[in-house]
């Protein structure tokens, strides 16, 4: 969380951003809130990106003002128009690109003053893993697959019964480049699994951490997975 203030005493307002990550090819949100104004006419929102000449987005006098918008963001940005009046300056970024990563500034002017805060935006790819029993294998084998990751993640297996065990000798992980030549499909195979145990396949890079769990008993198979973005710090 980053909290920024305006410069000049009583003419400053608090602006708050949250560092976040964007999943390339999908839509992302750059989070920014500010002390609300009671009327829309005096609110100006400017999004800027370090190293980019034009604006990322500008909203003023109740509408988008995109004449100064940089070409790389053309047609890809929007504020939440109904929420500006209550202090939400967050920016929706469509079709996130790898090159969208960087430092952004959310700059606000209202009738009560000015303020700004920076936001670190990371970009990459992350997806939920799915763990299945591989019935084609000669021994009891688990297969963990996740369709899109970037940068290349690490994959670690863990087990509820053998806590702390190192499965690197009995697992094999491969990374297959997807058709767009950036993201990769992650496939990890774990051999010699035992029944009545819960196994976890953990995939992690500097943007996200995802876990796929599978519980194998004689009568059923239970699966669960979750994904967590890393480094979501407010500013």
């Amino acid at each position: 969380l980053i909290i920024g203030f305006g410069i000049s005493g009583r003419h400053s307002i608090t602006v708050t951003t949250v560092a976040s990550a964007g999943n390339i090819g999908e839509d992302g949100i750059l989070s920014c809130t500010f002390e609300p104004d009671i009327k829309l006419s005096d609110i100006v929102i400017q999004w800027l990106k370090e190293g980019v000449l034009g604006l990322v987005h500008e909203f003023k006098e109740g509408k988008d003002e995109l004449s100064e918008q940089d070409e790389m963001f053309r047609g890809r940005t929007a504020v939440f128009a109904d929420q500006v009046i209550v202090g939400n300056a967050s920016l929706r970024l469509k079709n996130v690109q790898l090159t969208d990563a960087g430092t952004y500034k959310c700059y606000i002017i209202t009738s009560k003053g000015k303020g700004n805060a920076n936001l670190e935006y990371k970009t990459g790819a992350f997806s939920m893993p799915e763990v299945n029993v591989d019935y084609n294998a000669s021994s009891e084998t688990l297969r963990c697959e996740a369709p899109r990751w970037f940068p290349q993640p690490t994959v670690v297996w863990a087990s509820q019964v053998d806590q702390g065990a190192n499965f690197s000798e009995v697992s094999n992980t491969s990374f297959e480049l997807n058709s767009e030549n950036v993201t990769m499909k992650v496939v990890s195979v774990l051999y010699n699994v035992t029944i009545n145990n819960t196994y976890s396949c953990m995939i992690e890079n500097d943007i996200a951490k995802a876990t796929g769990d599978i519980k194998v008993t004689e009568s059923e198979i239970k699966r669960r997975s979750h994904l967590q973005l890393l480094n979501s710090k407010a500013s």
Epitope: E35, P36, I38, S41, G62, V86
Partner: antibody, heavy 115, light 107 residues
Framework: EVQLVQSGAEVKKPGASVKVSCKAS????????MNWVRQAPGQGLEWMGG????????EYNEKFKGRVTLTVDTSASTAYMELSSLRSEDTAVYYC????????WGQGTLVTVSS | DIVMTQSPSSLSASVGDRVTITCKAS??????VAWYQQKPGKSPKLLIS???YRYTGVPSRFSGSGSGTDFTFTISSLQPEDIATYYC?????????FGGGTKVEIK
């Protein structure tokens, strides 16, 4: 659940003052504007002003400037609207309403001005 | 002050009818218009903000459109529980101002 609970009905004489309270719960009181709106019997809605508790920023409708005073007690999450020099045409239901979208309203306080 | 002129002041329609209320601002208010519903003896309730955004929990039969000076509020299929007075409001500049209201009744 967001709730705005207003004080009870008041009967006042012309020239007197009235102070209406609005107790907020279910959200962060200091981070939203609190507006005051009145509605005379059988009439429409009229915005009187708003206050931003975190900073004490106040916006008044010029029509009421000098007669209306908006205050807050942040420790009690309560907003107040005081209207002075009352006249018969001030007879109305007075509402508090949360944030700049007026997304939640109090139940209203009837103020009757009569000699 | 920005004057919000609402019409009609009252209307009567049958259940299932499409109902349209208009609001004209005396100057450009961009899309800073909200619509409220007030049932007899009750407090107003926010239905639409920023011209067309339905507030949380508001049924999809309520919608809004417009920009600049001309705004429209529509009930696509009138229900008995929609009997109320509807108000438009601009939050573009202070003083914040409301339209005079439209009373909707069932035939």
């Amino acid at each position: 659940e967001v709730q705005l609970v207003q004080s009870g009905a008041e009967v006042k004489k012309p020239g007197a003052s009235v102070k209406v309270s609005c107790k907020a719960s279910g959200y962060t009181f200091t981070s939203s504007w609190m507006n005051w709106v009145r509605q005379a019997p059988g009439q429409g809605l009229e915005w009187m002003g708003g206050i931003y508790p975190n900073r004490g920023n106040i916006e008044y409708n010029e029509k009421f400037k000098g007669r209306v005073t908006l205050t807050v007690d942040t420790s009690a999450s309560t907003a107040y609207m005081e209207l002075s020099s009352l006249r018969s045409e001030d007879t109305a239901v007075y509402y508090c309403a949360r944030d700049s979208r007026f997304s939640y309203w109090g139940q209203g306080t009837l103020v009757t001005v009569s000699s | 002050d920005i004057v919000m002129t609402q019409s009609p002041s009252s209307l009567s329609a049958s259940v299932g009818d499409r109902v349209t209320i208009t609001c004209k601002a005396s100057q450009d208010v961009r899309t800073a218009v909200a619509w409220y519903q007030q049932k007899p003896g009750k407090s107003p309730k926010l239905l639409i903000s920023s011209t067309s955004y339905r507030y949380t929990g508001v049924p999809s039969r309520f919608s809004g459109s417009g920009s600049g000076t001309d705004f429209t509020f529509t009930i696509s299929s009138l229900q008995p529980e929609d009997i109320a007075t509807y108000y438009c409001q601009q939050h573009y500049s202070t003083p914040l101002t409301f339209g005079g209201g439209t009373k909707v009744e069932i035939k």
